[in-house]
């Protein structure tokens, strides 16, 4: 039975040209995290694997940095980066947990962080 919950940074906004940290945290489970995939819509951004470390997809290498922790840092943001991001936790023995973050990249300097929320 899957008992865990994923807490994410929720709906966030950032300025064009700036950077943002995407963070997820898995709690309420003793399951072992085998791998975390970060995806934007259906595109793979990055992988953090327990045995093999970090992998950043080639098309994002220049603008994506691993960490902090299992999170992901997006740099040199453009308006095209606006959209949904998913952290996919592959765990043993529970299975897969998915967290969603919506990022809005703004032209102006009125960007501010949204509240944290939980996805069961």
């Amino acid at each position: 039975m899957m008992t865990g919950t994923i807490e994410t940074t929720g709906n966030i906004s950032a300025e064009k040209g700036g950077s943002i940290i995407l963070q997820c945290h898995l709690s309420s489970t003793t399951a072992q995290v085998t791998q975390v995939n970060w995806e934007q819509q259906d595109q793979l951004l990055a992988i953090c694997n327990a045995d093999l470390g970090w992998h950043i997809s080639p098309s994002f290498k220049d603008r994506v940095a691993p960490g902090p922790g299992l999170g992901l840092t997006l740099q040199s943001l453009t308006v095209n980066d606006t959209g949904e991001y998913f952290c996919i936790y592959h765990t043993y023995p529970d299975g897969t947990y998915t967290g969603r973050i919506f990022l809005e990249v703004l032209e102006s300097s009125v960007a501010e962080h949204g509240a944290r929320f939980q996805i069961p």
Epitope: Q32, T34, Q35, N37, L44, I47, N49, D51, L52, G53, H55, S57, P58, H90, Y92
Partner: antibody
Framework: EVQLLESGGGLVQPGGSLRLSCAAS????????MSWVRQAPGKGLEWVSL????????YYADSVKGRFTISRDNSKNTLYLQMNSLRAEDTAIYYC?????????????WGQGTTVTVSS | QSVLTQPPSASGTPGQRVTISCSGS????????VSWYQQLPGTAPKLLIY???QRPSGVPDRFSGSKSGTSASLAISGLQSEDEADYYC???????????FGGGTKLTVL
Amino acid sequence: EVQLLESGGGLVQPGGSLRLSCAASGFTFDDYVMSWVRQAPGKGLEWVSLINWNGDKTYYADSVKGRFTISRDNSKNTLYLQMNSLRAEDTAIYYCAKHWIVFQYGMDVWGQGTTVTVSS
Amino acid sequence: QSVLTQPPSASGTPGQRVTISCSGSISNIETKYVSWYQQLPGTAPKLLIYNSDQRPSGVPDRFSGSKSGTSASLAISGLQSEDEADYYCVSWDASLKSWVFGGGTKLTVL
């Protein structure tokens, strides 16, 4: 269609060297962990070596450690196995295999294999 | 000798259900995923089961995988003559940092 095509097998004398290649197509090669697996005549499957996405982490079976080197060229979508100090017991069909996006799930696609014969 | 232990042979008649076992340890099967491969004579291995009990698309639902403790099983129901092949279990071993294979089970359809 995902395809793996091995080449480079042949007849070599004990103590000799051989370099196997595996050309990959139909998937984003950079995003997947790859392995070599071999099968001696009339025997079972034996894992040989594994390489992560960019080649900075490699693992080997004890039977080939120090003699074989796995590498990859992501710009050419090609996996390699450099085999040195070959022994009669290295005679086998060598398969390259692509792993699932979570490499611990196993190997989902295999090539047809290339035959290596070590004999004087 | 293989790290994972499988019976060398198994058999059944058409339509029967056959189970192949795979025994390992805490560092592989008990705490990791298991996959199963079918190898028809003269061909490359083909994936049947991954993540212990998941079937890739294209694999008939006659094939199923399960796991309990340090053992895993592959079940084939409604046995057919084309199922005659060698079957291998595989798991990543966290201690050895290597893939470990079972010795293989030769399935004969009588």
